[in-house]
Structures are given as structure tokens and as C-alpha cells.
């Protein structure tokens, strides 16, 4: 499956929008930094079949979409930027879903891939727990925004490697 060129443009647009969403001085949030245990090894792209990589990317984008679709997120961010960001993510999900169907077909997803998807889900659970513990404070959201920018960058790099494999 060849992801459309618009997909990588959408990736870049999503990152730009996320960068623009900041509302407070990042410097004031230094003490709130947190290790969410991003599963980097799931995004290095070496041990995966293409179908598995696409499934993990899909899970990453889906969980990001879910995180920024909550009521708490709506209260934290400027509405028009948030809507544009969500739209970009939604388009990426559609592209990836089409690819998942094409690449995997009717085959069962390998167990290794289930572990990878679980690692991504647990990562987002840790992010949600952090936000809850910090009572969804402005700094907590800034830290999460920075973290998601970093994890989306890993996703973008994995997609670039997948395109090079084609």
C-alpha cells in the first residue's frame, strides 16, 4: 500500500498545528516534565513487516485523536486550531485504515504486533493518568503537547522509512 503524498503533508500540518497550540510560556512548566515511557522501539521500523508498522502507526494516531477529542482537551486549547488538528488526524486515520485492510487483508494480526499496539495504548494511559494527577493544569497540557509532538515526529520518521522500503 502506498500512502498518498497528501498523507505526509498532513503529518507535517498536524505537527505545525500542534506547535501553534501552545498558550503559555513553556519555560514556566520546566518542573512539570515527565517520563511517559514512549515506546521508541516500536517506531524504529526494523523488526516490523510493513503491515505491522502501519497498524502501530494507526494506533498512535487513533490514541492521539482520542486524547485531543476529550472535553478537557476542548477546554485547554484554542478551538479552531484544535478542530484543524483533529481533522488532520482524522484524515491520516482514513489513509492508514485503507492501508491496513490492503496490507493485512484477512490475515490474523501477528501476536508481536498485538504487543506493540498494547505498548502504545499503555503509553497513552500513562499520559491520561498524568493529566488526571495534575488536574489538567495548563502546564500539564503543555508537557503533554510537547510529548505528543515528539511521538508524532517518531511516527513521521517511521512513515518515511516505510516509503523508502517501497
Amino acid at each position: 500500500c502506498d500512502l498518498p503524498q497528501t498523507h505526509s503533508l498532513g503529518n507535517r500540518r498536524a505537527l505545525i498545528l500542534l506547535a501553534q497550540m501552545g498558550r503559555i510560556s513553556h519555560f514556566s512548566c520546566l518542573k512539570d516534565r515527565h517520563d511517559f515511557g514512549f515506546p521508541e522501539e516500536e517506531f524504529d521500523g526494523h523488526q516490523f513487516q510493513k503491515a505491522q508498522a502501519i497498524s502501530v502507526l494507526h494506533e498512535m494516531i487513533q490514541q492521539t485523536f482520542n486524547l485531543f477529542s476529550t472535553e478537557d482537551s476542548s477546554a485547554a486549547w484554542e478551538q479552531s486550531l484544535l478542530e484543524k488538528f483533529s481533522t488532520e488526524l482524522y484524515q491520516q486515520l482514513n489513509d492508514l485504515e485503507a492501508c491496513v485492510i490492503q496490507e493485512v487483508g484477512v490475515e490474523e494480526t501477528p501476536l508481536m504486533n498485538e504487543d506493540s499496539i498494547l505498548a502504545v495504548r499503555k503509553y497513552f494511559q500513562r499520559i491520561t493518568l498524568y493529566l488526571t494527577e495534575k488536574k489538567y493544569s495548563p502546564c500539564a497540557w503543555e508537557v503533554v503537547r510537547a510529548e505528543i509532538m515528539r511521538s508524532l515526529s517518531f511516527s513521521t520518521n517511521l512513515q518515511k522509512r516505510l516509503r523508502r522500503k517501497d
Epitope: A19, G22, K31, R33, D35, A146, E147, S153
Partner: antibody, heavy 121, light 107 residues
Framework: EVQLVQSGAEVKKPGESLKISCKGS????????IGWVRQMPGKGLEWMGI????????RYSPSFQGQVTISADKSISTAYLQWSSLKASDTAMYYC??????????????WGQGTLVTVSS | DIQMTQSPSSLSASVGDRVTITCRAS??????LNWYQQKPGKAPKLLIK???SLQSGVPSRFSGSGSGTDFTLTISSLQPEDFATYYC?????????FGQGTKVEIK
Amino acid sequence: EVQLVQSGAEVKKPGESLKISCKGSGYSFTSYWIGWVRQMPGKGLEWMGIIDPSDSDTRYSPSFQGQVTISADKSISTAYLQWSSLKASDTAMYYCARHPGLAWAPDFDYWGQGTLVTVSS
Amino acid sequence: DIQMTQSPSSLSASVGDRVTITCRASQSIRNSLNWYQQKPGKAPKLLIKWASSLQSGVPSRFSGSGSGTDFTLTISSLQPEDFATYYCQQLYDWPLTFGQGTKVEIK
């Protein structure tokens, strides 16, 4: 490959102005803050201040506040450190280094090669 | 400001020795501490991040420990290329202060 390349050595007279640079490459420049560190001859490291190139927000060490200005031009992936009126005591090696901001990644993992500033009459 | 006090300020050791450098913060900085190595005429090099995590590409003879106010950098078996000055830096609060440095010299 991530690189921070600093401008060359400078020899200036007291009272003169100066702007030194730090150009980032091999990574997304606006995703990392750029910090500046001073090292006077035979002395230790002193943290001067930092800039977020995405919005040019800055934070200075109280020791350097008002003495220097940190700026950035994200269109050319370059951060700057400048003086409006140099003093002999500004003679030092100046380093830039990148910081991942609020993301959980190594702080100051890449450094520039340093710019030696000599101020003498 | 958070003061960072390193000890000793210098030490003499032989190749193969186990070397320990300590760094004390004037208030708790959790695990927000880096250790750097600097050789004459060169930029500092990150060795240890987050107090105990080895930076990529750094030999495993280097290790870091501690949390809160007391931190340690250990070189398990000193090599000829390890003779340098070592600095700790707190990254918890502004300004991001350094320790005064520890020079490791050949005995």
C-alpha cells in the same frame, strides 16, 4: 546528523558590539530550545540563558540578564548571542547547546564547537 | 538559585582505578541532573542524563546514581581517555546551574 555550528572567533575592543551565531541542522530547529553557556579562561561552565526558537521566548540567568541578548531566526535555523557594549570581562569561550523543551529527551545532548570572544584594548 | 556543589574539585588517579565524583544540590531536584565530560579546548559531552541514564554512545564504565539532593558519577575502571574535567548540572529549575567541576588527573 545533528549539528550545531557556531561562528568563528572574535577579537573586539571594549565598548564595541558583537553578535555571535549558532546554526542548527539535522533536526527540527523549532522543536528544541537553544541554550548558551559561558566558560571564562581556566574556569567552569556558567549557564547564561535559553531561547525557544518557535516563538523567540527567552529565559536568562539573573547573572546575565541585561548584559546580553539572546535571539533566533527560525527561517535560517540560527540562534544568536549579542552584546551592545563589550567589557574585558566578557572574554570567554561561548557554547550553544540544544534542549528538548518540555519533552522527555536528553537535555543539552548536542553542543556547538564554541566561539572564542576576546575583548582587549 | 539552586546551588550545585561538586566534590572533590580535583583528584589524581591511575588507569584502572574506580573513581567517584559527588554532586549536591541545595534543594531537591528530583532526578533532573546531567553529568558532562570536558576535555581541554573541546565542548562538553553529555555522559549521563536524568541522574542515572547513560547517554547513547557513552561507555558502560560510566554510571550515575542519586535522586533529590545527592548524586554520584562513577567511572568503574578509569581509562587513559577519561582524564578530563567533569561537571554536573541541574535541569529542574531556572537558572540551570552547573557544579564547579572536578578535574581528574593522572597520578
